[in-house]
């Protein structure tokens, strides 16, 4: 029986050009984690494997940093980074646990502040 649960940072927002840490935590199971995959929609961002360590997908190498822990740091955020992110824990013997994080990348606070008070 898969008794575990994944706690995530949930819905988060960050400023364009900034960085954000995506984090998941697996609890309530004795299962042992062999690998964690980080995905954005259907794109693989990174893998943390028990033997091989971290692998960052080539297309994200410049903007993705491993850690802290099994988490992932996204840097130089753009509005296009807005969307769903998934942490996929491959565990023995339970199998796969998936956590979801929704990231919204906002225009810089100055721009956002200006837009908010614009007179039509």
């Amino acid at each position: 029986m898969m008794t575990g649960t994944i706690e995530t940072t949930g819905n988060i927002s960050a400023e364009k050009g900034g960085s954000i840490i995506l984090q998941c935590h697996l609890s309530s199971t004795t299962a042992q984690v062999t690998q964690v995959n980080w995905e954005q929609q259907d794109q693989l961002l990174a893998i943390c494997n028990a033997d091989l360590g971290w692998h960052i997908s080539p297309s994200f190498k410049d903007r993705v940093a491993p850690g802290p822990g099994l988490g992932l740091t996204l840097q130089s955020l753009t509005v296009n980074d807005t969307g769903e992110y998934f942490c996929i824990y491959h565990t023995y013997p339970d199998g796969t646990y998936t956590g979801r994080i929704f990231l919204e990348v906002l225009e810089s606070s100055v721009a956002e502040h200006g837009a908010r008070f614009q007179i039509p």
């Epitope: 062999t34 023995y92 013997p93």
Partner: antibody, heavy 119, light 109 residues
Framework: QVQLVQSGAEVKKPGASVKISCKAS????????MNWVRQAPGQGLEWMGW????????TYAQKFQGRFTFTLDTSTSTAYLEISSLRSEDTAVYYC????????????WGQGTLVTVSS | QAVVTQEPSLTVSPGGTVTLTCGSS?????????ANWVQQKPGQAFRGLIR???GRGSWTPARFSGSLLGGKAALTISGAQPEDEAEYYC?????????FGGGTKLTVL
């Protein structure tokens, strides 16, 4: 390369205890679970349970709760199976196998340890 | 406890294709059963061939493939070799424990 090397054959009297070892090499011991499986003469394979090598927490199959104990020595990358109050029906070959969570299952196996219980 | 069934024995010609199956007394086998296939050659240790229904070990030859077929787990050997002659055991995961089948003795003749 990954290897699981088990201790040698044991002959014990009923009521005695035995402790068999499974020494792992070629990978980080605490990253993968360790299973114990037995095969009695002329019988099939039975999964006894597994131990989380990171936390040290054992999980026993229902049939193997009580007289069977899984332990670890992480400093030597060794898993142990201890059986107390041995009975003749404990005569079997005992195997350790590594538990992998990426495509769930048992990937590497030890060569087996024959335990014979006889008066 | 569930009973896992395999063909007791099968024969294949060298270069031929053979499918070994693994059924469950509880109903159709699914991906949640994480079907495993383990090979044992005479006088040798067990070797994990397939994990998680269709995941090959890094040492598993490409001619071995795992799948679900008609409600059972299946191991297909395409282009059997003499060295494939062995006993093959399947194991299925049932929520909190593994159950092994009785094994299939494969002869390459």
């Amino acid at each position: 390369q990954v290897q699981l090397v088990q201790s040698g054959a044991e002959v014990k009297k009923p009521g005695a205890s035995v402790k068999i070892s499974c020494k792992a090499s070629g990978y980080t011991f605490t990253n993968y679970g360790m299973n114990w499986v037995r095969q009695a003469p002329g019988q099939g394979l039975e999964w006894m349970g597994w131990i989380n090598t990171y936390t040290g927490e054992p999980t026993y199959a229902q049939k193997f709760q009580g007289r069977f104990t899984f332990t670890l020595d992480t400093s030597t990358s060794t898993a142990y199976l201890e059986i107390s109050s041995l009975r003749s029906e404990d005569t079997a070959v005992y195997y350790c196998s590594r538990g992998n969570g990426y495509y769930v299952g048992m990937d590497y196996w030890g060569q087996g340890t024959l335990v014979t219980v006889s008066s | 406890q569930a009973v896992v069934t395999q063909e007791p024995s099968l024969t294949v010609s060298p270069g031929g294709t053979v499918t070994l199956t693994c059924g469950s007394s509880t109903g159709a086998v699914t991906t949640s059963n994480h079907a495993n296939w383990v090979q044992q050659k005479p006088g040798q240790a067990f070797r994990g061939l397939i994990r998680g229904t269709n995941g090959r070990g890094s040492w598993t030859p490409a001619r071995f493939s795992g799948s679900l077929l008609g409600g059972k787990a299946a191991l297909t050997i395409s282009g059997a070799q003499p060295e494939d002659e062995a006993e093959y055991y399947c194991a299925l995961w049932f929520s909190n424990h593994w159950v092994f089948g009785g094994g299939t003795k494969l002869t390459v003749l």
